[in-house]
């Protein structure tokens, strides 16, 4: 199953992925690749870690900005373009035969809206608005953001109307979601 995340052209996309090191500090290699998770490893690798740190990155736009040493291996793609759209594979390479954890996430990059958003709200929507993706094979996916979010099937223009963003910001606060400001 895939969770779908939205980002606007020119902004940063956040694709969540995490595991719990057991015992704490016992890190395992992780790779991020473009495309659904294949049988082995990652194809079209964009970023790779070893047991200590990131050791391979195909572009300076790919970053792990979370607490890598606690198992937060969420991928941030800076300054996204339409070409960044698609499925990404986060593969947690747990030692052993066929032990890897595989997570597919889908990034949808949208063109900038013509309406200028409120300057205080960071336009990194992917963490705040995962949206449900239903496929014939797997059924509905589960979102990874806690709290009851507002309906994500709003029109794109609604996201960028200042009044809507103000309302949305308050709704998110009420739901307990984190609001990041510039």
């Amino acid at each position: 199953s895939e969770v779908e995340y939205i980002a606007e052209v020119g902004q940063n996309a956040y694709l969540p992925c995490s595991y719990t090191p057991a015992p704490p500090g016992n890190l395992v290699p992780v790779c991020w690749g473009k495309g659904a998770c294949p049988v082995f490893d990652c194809s079209n690798v964009v970023l790779r870690t070893d047991n200590r740190d990131v050791n391979d990155r195909t572009s300076g736009r790919y970053w792990l900005k979370g607490d890598f040493h606690k198992g937060d291996v969420s991928l941030t793609i800076e300054n996204v373009t339409l070409a960044d759209s698609g499925v990404y594979c986060c593969r947690i390479q747990i030692p052993g035969i066929m032990n890897d954890e595989k997570h597919n996430v889908k990034l949808v990059v949208i063109k900038p809206a013509k309406v200028t958003p409120a300057p205080t709200l960071q336009r990194d929507l992917t963490s705040a608005f995962p949206r449900m993706l239903t496929t014939g094979e797997h059924g509905p996916a589960e979102t990874q953001t806690p709290g009851s979010l507002p309906d994500v099937n709003l029109t794109v223009s609604n996201f960028f109307c200042e009044l809507q963003i103000f309302t949305l910001t308050n709704e998110l606060r009420d739901s307990g979601a984190t609001i990041r400001t510039a």
Partner: antibody, heavy 116, light 107 residues
Framework: EVQLVESGGGLVQPGGSLRLSCAAS????????MSWVRQAPGKGLEWVAN????????YYVDSVKGRFTISRDSAKNSLYLQMNSLRAEDTAMYFC?????????WGQGTLVTVSS | ETVMTQSPATLSVSPGERATLSCRAS??????LAWYQRKPGQAPRLLIY???TRATGIPARFSGSGSGTEFTLTISSLQSEDFAVYYC?????????FGGGTKVEIK
Amino acid sequence: EVQLVESGGGLVQPGGSLRLSCAASGFTFSSYWMSWVRQAPGKGLEWVANIKQDGSEKYYVDSVKGRFTISRDSAKNSLYLQMNSLRAEDTAMYFCARDSNFFDYWGQGTLVTVSS
Amino acid sequence: ETVMTQSPATLSVSPGERATLSCRASQSVSSNLAWYQRKPGQAPRLLIYFSSTRATGIPARFSGSGSGTEFTLTISSLQSEDFAVYYCQQYNNWPLTFGGGTKVEIK
């Protein structure tokens, strides 16, 4: 330039053994999975086995499990396939390939013939 | 295992014409599909991976499309050097499997 050169093929009787080798150059051998793929006369391609960068994971197609063993030596940039209890149906051209789940570089192959 | 079925088994085409090769998977392989070219006495050559991405050095006349279970390799204008056998291969499901091949021959 990436190069993969196989050796060790030949004629062997059913039940016999052979060890294939593949010498790799032109890329960082220790950074890639490696595979053996074969093609029987008049047939299509068949993936046989592969091995992780550090040798910690090895996978085999069902038809060779328990008979073939894949291994690697990163110090020598070499890949191996030990083939035991060979059968007539193992007759094929065996290719060494760099494995990215798909196979982006291949050797020219070495022919294994199992016949009495 | 995921069975890959290629059609037609043989395709007779004149130089300069378009060739369309089909590959069908018995279950979804997402976009994790590659195409190879094999000529007699030569090693297979990777043409396409990730369903539609051309490998390094592959001419633009080769293109791939499809996802899920239906895939197509198109050669827009066949050159003399393109007459060969073409194989698809899925790498989404265990084990890795190839199609039976399509022979593209001169008409």
